[in-house]
Amino acid sequence: CRTSECCFQDPPYPDADSGSASGPRDLRCYRISSDRYECSWQYEGPTAGVSHFLRCCLSSGRCCYFAAGSATRLQFSDQAGVSVLYTVTLWVESWARNQTEKSPEVTLQLYNSVKYEPPLGDIKVSKLAGQLRMEWETPDNQVGAEVQFRHRTPSSPWKLGDCGPQDDDTESCLCPLEMNVAQEFQLRRRQLGSQGSSWSKWSSPVCVPPENPPQPQVRFSVEQLGQDGRRRLTLKEQPTQLELPEGCQGLAPGTEVTYRLQLHMLSCPCKAKATRTLHLGKMPYLSGAAYNVAVISSNQFGPGLNQTWHIPADTHTEPVALNISVGTNGTTMYWPARAQSMTYCIEWQPVGQDGGLATCSLTAPQDPDPAGMATYSWSRESGAMGQEKCYYITIFASAHPEKLTLWSTVLSTYHFGGNASAAGTPHHVSVKNHSLDSVSVDWAPSLLSTCPGVLKEYVVRCRDEDSKQVSEHPVQPTETQVTLSGLRAGVAYTVQVRADTAWLRGVWSQPQRFSIEVQVSD
C-alpha cells in the first residue's frame, strides 16, 4: 500500500487488545481545505516504540488503515480511498510492546466536519439562581455548536456535563456551583447537526471560587500603647488559603479570596466617621480606644461570613497629665497639646457604668496656647460631668478627624465631677483614746477615693482649744486612720479631716471635740 492511501488490508500486527486504560484518545478528524483532511489524537503513556495506525470503516463495511508511525497527526486527501461524503467510523490503534491499544471511535461525514475551536478569549462567569453561568463570544464563523463542559474539585475527578445546543454570536452554559470548594471548568464545542463531528480541544481552565468564601480564621494581637498614643494591630495567623484543583494551581484568576479589615471605633461616638475598611495586608495603628474589628472574606460572588473581635480600650491612666480648674463660670481642662491644628475628642463616662453611657465632645481644630497646652471648657449649665461622682476621661487627638486610623490617645484619667471639694469631705470621724497622751482618729473613706488617682491626700487638723494652737497631719490617700500624740490630759481639742485633690483643697469635716481624761493615781 502507498503511504498516501488508506490500505484495505489487515494491519501489520496481531490484534492483541491490552485492556489498558492508557493509549490513544481524543481523536478529532475534520476537513482542512477543499480536498484535504486531518485527524489528530493524543497518546497517554510511554511513547517509546509506539506505532500509531488510523483505522477507518466505510459505510460499505470495508475497512482500511493509514500508518502514522510515531506521529499523532495525519493528513490525507479525498483521493486516499476514504469516502468523505458518506459516514465513516475512524479510530486509532497504537501498537506497542506486542499489544494494541484503541481509542474510542468517531463516526462522521468527513466533508461536513469542520474543525471547531473551544471557547477562546474571555469567559465571563456569573451567578444565576444558585448556578454558575458562563458566557463567551462564539469563535469566528462557528455559529451553531453543541457545547460540553467538564469540571472537577480538588478532591474529585472530572465530571462531564452538557450545555446544550448554541446558535448565536454569544454562547453560554449553566453549570453547578459548589458551596464550599473551588472548581476548575473546561469547555469544548463541536459542530451542531453534523452527525459524529469531532469535539474541539478543551478550553483553557476556568477557575471558579466556591459560592461561600472561606470563613477567615485569623487571630490578632495588639501592641502596647506607645508614646505617640497609638498601638499596632498585628495579625498573628494568616487566613487559610483556598485549596485549588490541579489546573488552577499557580495562577488562578477567578478564585481569589480577598480579605478586608473593617474597623469600628467604639469610643468617641461624636466623631464624624466611626468605621473604616482596609486591606488585610495593611495592618493599621490604632488609638487606645475600644474597637470592634471584623475580617470580611469575599470573592467574585460577593462577601462571605465574617469574623469579629472586640479590642478593649487601653485603660492605662496618666493621673498628672490633665489639669482641671473649676471657676464660677464653669470648668476648664488643660493638657499638653499634641501639635498645631489638632482636633480633640474628649470622652467621659461615669465609672462602673456601661460603656454605652459615654458622652463626648469634639473640639474645633486648635493650636497650642503659649504654654503649649490644649484646652476644653464647659459651663455648669451644660451639665457635663456635673454629678458628684467619678468619671473616666479619655482625650483623643487627630489632625485628620475624618480618618479613623489617624486618631491617637492623648491621655486617660479620672475626674470627680460636681462640687468635688464638698462631696469629698470625709464623714463619720471618730476619736478613740490610744494612750495617756495620744488618740486614734478614724473616718470613713472619702467619695474621692472611688476615683483612682484623684484623692491626693487626707489632712487631719487638731486644734488645742486652750492655746488655739493648730497642727495639721497629712495622711496617705489609702489610709483612713491616724494617731495624734503629744496631747495633754484635761485639755479640750477639736479634730477635723479633709480630702484634697491635686488641684482642689477639700472642705473640712464637722469639728469633733474630745479630751484625754486626767488620770488620778490611787
Epitope: 490484534d15 485492556g19 470503516c57 470495508r62 475497512c63 463516526t107
Partner: nanobody
Framework: QVQLVESGGGAVQAGGSLRLSCAAS????????MAWFRQAPGIEREFVAS???????YYADSVKDRFTISRDNAENTVYLQMNSLKPEDTAVYRC???????????????WGQGTQVTVSS
C-alpha cells in the same frame, strides 16, 4: 469463554414495543462491537444494528428511527429498544460480539442463542 445471553423477546401486536437485552460474560477486551442480527424462517440472516466501544451506532435502513441500540459498559450488556413494531419484524433476534475488525469490518466471533420476537397484525 465468552457467553452471550439474550432476553426480552415475546409476542406483541403491531405498533407495540419490546426491549431486548444481551448480557456478555468472559470478555477480556474493552474494545468490541456489539450487534443485533435477525433471521426469519427461510430468509437470510440480516444485520439490524451495532454499537461500537466508543458509542457509535449503525442501523439497517429498515429499522432506522424505530429501533435504538444502547449499551452499559459496566454491565457488559447491550439493549435493543424496538418501537412501532411491524409484522415483518417477526424473527429470531441474535446478539453478536466482534472483538476484531478486519478489512470487511467487525468479525463477529461470538453469538447468542437468540430470542423470538413475534409481531401479529
Amino acid at each position: 469463554q465468552v457467553q452471550l445471553v439474550e432476553s426480552g423477546g415475546g409476542a406483541v401486536q403491531a405498533g407495540g414495543s419490546l426491549r431486548l437485552s444481551c448480557a456478555a460474560s468472559g470478555l477480556t477486551s474493552r474494545h468490541y462491537v456489539m450487534a443485533w442480527f435477525r433471521q426469519a424462517p427461510g430468509i437470510e440472516r440480516e444485520f439490524v444494528a451495532s454499537i461500537w466501544w466508543g458509542g457509535s451506532t449503525y442501523y439497517a435502513d429498515s429499522v432506522k428511527d424505530r429501533f435504538t441500540i444502547s449499551r452499559d459498559n459496566a454491565e457488559n450488556t447491550v439493549y435493543l429498544q424496538m418501537n412501532s413494531l411491524k409484522p415483518e419484524d417477526t424473527a429470531v433476534y441474535r446478539c453478536a460480539v466482534g472483538t476484531k475488525i478486519g478489512t470487511m469490518g467487525p468479525r463477529y466471533d461470538y453469538w447468542g442463542q437468540g430470542t423470538q420476537v413475534t409481531v401479529s397484525s
